[in-house]
Interface confidence: medium
Amino acid sequence: ELCDDDPPEIPHATFKAMAYKEGTMLNCECKRGFRRIKSGSLYMLCTGNSSHSSWDNQCQCTSSATRNTTKQVTPQPEEQKERKTTEMQSPMQPVDQASLPGHCREPPPWENEATERIYHFVVGQMVYYQCVQGYRALHRGPAESVCKMTHGKTRWTQPQLICTGEMETSQFPGEEKPQASPEGRPESETSCLVTTTDFQIQTEMAATMETSIFTTEYQ
């Protein structure tokens, strides 16, 4: 089940998945001047069994100017290549979540992929929060959020984190700081008071992917 909601917004914080639950989709996006080949995959999918998970499909990009040549890299789940992008890198990982059953590692890059990766999370996905540069983490609990299914709706739990504007580098994500009240409401596992603004029912479901989600083919 896709999470039809965004993880919570924490002021002056960003978040990251350390590993991806089976069912997660990663768009096959190409950098400027390149495009997906017509017969190529639209997305990669984290699949697997109880003992091993890996990314299905290959992302293939070809020059927009050429029609014949394709560049591709077959994703190897065991391979952990460094991605040289402008994205923030976490100083440490809380757990080697990629070694957990039912999770895929960050896929290695493919040739001419876009500079940013677009993921679509599923129920059970966990993301970890970190204060942006120049802000310090204050939290009384885990700086993480999990996508859960509650009463037929998906929701993300509220991370117990606030970021203060003190010029001090925060450790990520388990550094203990003085207690402070987190922004936002505490999560209630039993509450069923759900409004349409909390959870928007989306029509974009994996079952209708070919017909309703993906539109025109590149020429």
């Epitope: 909601d5 965004d6 960003t14 768009n27 994205e87 890198q89 989600i213």
Partner: nanobody, 130 residues
Framework: QVQLVESGGGSVQAGGSLRLSCAAS?????????MAWFRQAPGKERDFVGS????????SYADSVKDRFTISRDNAKSTVYLQMNNTKPEDTAVYYC??????????????????????WGQGTQVTVSS
């Protein structure tokens, strides 16, 4: 990649309402994109108006339009809207729709800086007369 086309611009009297639309197309998931509206008055910088996260969970507005403008989106129609109420002459500008991709690494759900948006529409003119 996504292509953006704005519509709904035109002339309106001060205090009136206008609804702008921005239709997205491209071979991708529309919910991959955070969306925003910017505006540019003659001889001025392109300024942030409002933004909305990929599922509509989060919105952010410029102080000058708070409580007057509302941004929303319909992922089934691949469209983002800007409802402009109680318009003022200073709202006169070319309004641009913009999109940014969600990254697999650290990201924030709502972005407000124009440099953070990779995709732009051609713009639609809004004129508010007093």
């Amino acid at each position: 990649q996504v292509q953006l086309v704005e519509s709904g611009g035109g002339s309106v009297q001060a205090g009136g309402s206008l609804r702008l639309s921005c239709a997205a197309s491209g071979r991708t998931l529309y919910s991959s994109y955070g969306m925003a509206w910017f505006r540019q008055a003659p001889g001025k910088e392109r300024d942030f108006v409002g933004s909305i996260s990929r599922y509509g969970t989060y919105t952010s507005y410029a102080d000058s339009v708070k409580d007057r403008f509302t941004i929303s989106r319909d992922n089934a129609k691949s469209t983002v809207y800007l409802q402009m109420n109680n318009t003022k002459p200073e709202d006169t500008a070319v309004y641009y729709c913009a999109a940014y991709t969600y990254s697999g690494s650290f990201y924030s759900a709502v972005k407000t800086h124009r440099d953070e948006y990779q995709y732009w529409g051609q713009g639609t003119q809004v004129t508010v007369s007093s």
